[in-house]
């Protein structure tokens, strides 16, 4: 039961995380105009991975896509790539994990196969979360660097425009969404990996049975046959549980609470 709960929770947490990664990638507020020096501006600038926007105090917003690929900074391209890789891995992970869920019966799929799929999806979620966190962190680092370097007539590297006015950009909402979403995906992946251990029927113990053949007094006592899971052997003797439930010497791991600044 605990394994099912851990697996289910890992799936849900990862699902929320990947939805957050997709949302962050699509958001326009990766960087927003720093209003510290000009809190009374009637024009507010903000930028995303795909386009830059200007919101006028009159309420009108104009967004322009970055219609160049070669003219964009390498760092921005790298962030885009990381986020897309994160989304793709996460999406595949979700697809795999749906079939791996213990509560879903698909033909006569063995627990070992489900364990394999659970681990695969878990690893995919972990990599997906790391990609998102890395992408957001690279962008944040780029912002911090540009923030202190930003001076009049300096090229800031967003959208390939030369700035003739000192406009400094600070962290936008998408960065925080990305960090949290990446963290959730990572936690979900870890939970899937933990659930995989409980799913794997690592050792099947058969009761010793005496077979008395006629004319022979030979007792046949088979040893404990190990069912190979493909995740490394475990020499510990474990009690047998129905339905691949958690064993006694496994510790349930809960996602730790993170504070995102």
């Amino acid at each position: 039961m605990a394994v099912t709960a851990c697996q289910g929770l890992g799936f849900v947490v990862s699902l929320i995380g990947i939805a957050g990664i997709i949302a962050a990638t699509c958001m326009d507020q990766w960087s927003t105009q720093d209003l510290y020096n000009n809190p009374v501006t009637a024009v507010f600038n903000y930028q995303g991975l795909w386009r830059s926007c200007v919101r006028e105090s009159s309420g009108f917003t104009e967004c322009r896509g970055y219609f160049t690929l070669l003219g964009l900074p390498a760092m921005l391209q790298a962030v885009r790539a990381l986020m897309i890789v994160g989304i793709v891995l996460g999406a595949i992970g979700l697809l795999v994990s749906i079939f791996a869920l213990k509560c879903i019966r698909i033909g006569s799929m063995e627990d070992s196969a489900k364990a394999n799929m659970t681990l695969t999806s878990g690893i995919m979620f972990i990599v997906s979360g790391l990609c998102a966190i890395a992408g957001v962190s690279v962008f944040a680092n780029m912002l911090v660097t540009n923030f202190w370097m930003s001076t009049a007539n300096m090229y800031t590297g967003m959208g390939g425009m030369v700035q003739t006015v000192q406009t400094r950009y600070t962290f936008g909402a998408a960065l925080f969404v990305g960090w949290v979403a990446g963290g959730l995906t990572l936690i979900g992946g870890v939970m899937m990996c933990i659930a995989c251990r409980g799913l794997a029927p690592e050792e099947t113990n058969y009761k010793a049975v005496s077979y008395h053949a006629s004319g022979h007094s030979v007792a046949y006592k088979p040893g404990g046959f190990k069912a190979s899971t493909g995740f490394g052997s475990n020499t510990k003797n474990k009690k047998i549980y129905d339905g691949g439930a958690r064993t006694e010497d496994e510790v349930q791991s809960y996602p730790s609470k993170h504070d995102y600044v």
């Epitope: 009374v40 009637a42 104009e62 006015v165």
Partner: antibody, heavy 118, light 113 residues
Framework: QVQLVQSGAEVKKPGASVKVSCKAS????????MNWVKQAPGQGLEWIGQ????????KYNGNFKGRVTITADTSASTAYMELSSLRSEDTAVYFC???????????WGQGTLVTVSS | DIVMTQSPDSLAVSLGERATINCKSS????????????LTWYQQKPGQPPKLLIY???TRDSGVPDRFSGSGSGTDFTLTISSLQAEDVAVYYC?????????FGGGTKVEIK
């Protein structure tokens, strides 16, 4: 078509208050900021403040803050500008104007002359 | 606050001739995000409210004759009437639309010589 119709001329004594109205028609009143602009006789234009009727959000020019209150009644599609503690230098024509793309004033009321005299 | 300075205070031009009004702001009105200058021009005829002519320094409002054109960037702007007509006699104002408080120039009175 868009129209802004202001209330009639007012004569007030120093220290009194005046409330000028601006009735809008021909557009979604709640969706555009309404501005108030002062023009003293023979002088230039001076922005007083603005209101977003949709949520009542206001912005004021510091020169008028504390003495001016801008309000709006969405059901009547009318904006109001109340100026208190009137002085002789408040004698002017007050215009309401709709805020538009480019942060410009695309439609203006006909103006309301407020005369402050003892 | 951004100070808008217009020159000249008044201008007398012959009919059909070019009229040029200058406007200088104390701070740049160029927004780096969209490379647009947040400067507006208005025309005010006697006894009437101002009328929008040009926004974003060079974009004519609908219905404004093409003899009116705006140019400039950053802190220096110009309104040009390529061929002055009798109905163009008015006071012209520039306005900072970039930072609060929204401020206007002192105005330039255009007359016929």
């Amino acid at each position: 078509q868009v129209q802004l119709v202001q209330s009639g001329a007012e004569v007030k004594k120093p220290g009194a208050s005046v409330k000028v109205s601006c009735k809008a028609s021909g557009y979604a009143f709640s969706n555009y900021w309404m501005n108030w602009v002062k023009q003293a006789p023979g002088q230039g234009l001076e922005w007083i403040g603005q209101i977003y009727p949709g949520n009542g959000d206001t912005k004021y020019n510091g020169n008028f803050k504390g003495r001016v209150t801008i309000t709006a009644d969405t059901s009547a599609s009318t904006a109001y500008m109340e100026l208190s503690s009137l002085r002789s230098e408040d004698t002017a024509v007050y215009f309401c104007a709709r805020y538009y793309r480019g942060n410009c004033f695309d439609y203006w009321g006909q103006g309301t002359l407020v005369t402050v005299s003892s | 606050d951004i100070v808008m300075t217009q020159s000249p205070d008044s201008l007398a031009v012959s009919l059909g001739e070019r009229a040029t009004i200058n406007c200088k702001s104390s701070q740049s009105l160029l927004n780096s995000g969209n490379q647009k200058n947040y400067l507006t021009w208005y025309q005010q005829k006697p006894g009437q409210p101002p009328k929008l002519l040009i926004y974003w320094a060079s974009t004519r409002d609908s219905g404004v004759p093409d003899r009116f054109s705006g140019s400039g960037s950053g802190t220096d702007f110009t309104l040009t009437i390529s061929s002055l007509q009798a109905e163009d006699v008015a006071v012209y104002y520039c306005q900072n639309a970039y930072t609060y408080p929204l401020t206007f120039g002192g105005g330039t009175k255009v007359e016929i010589k």
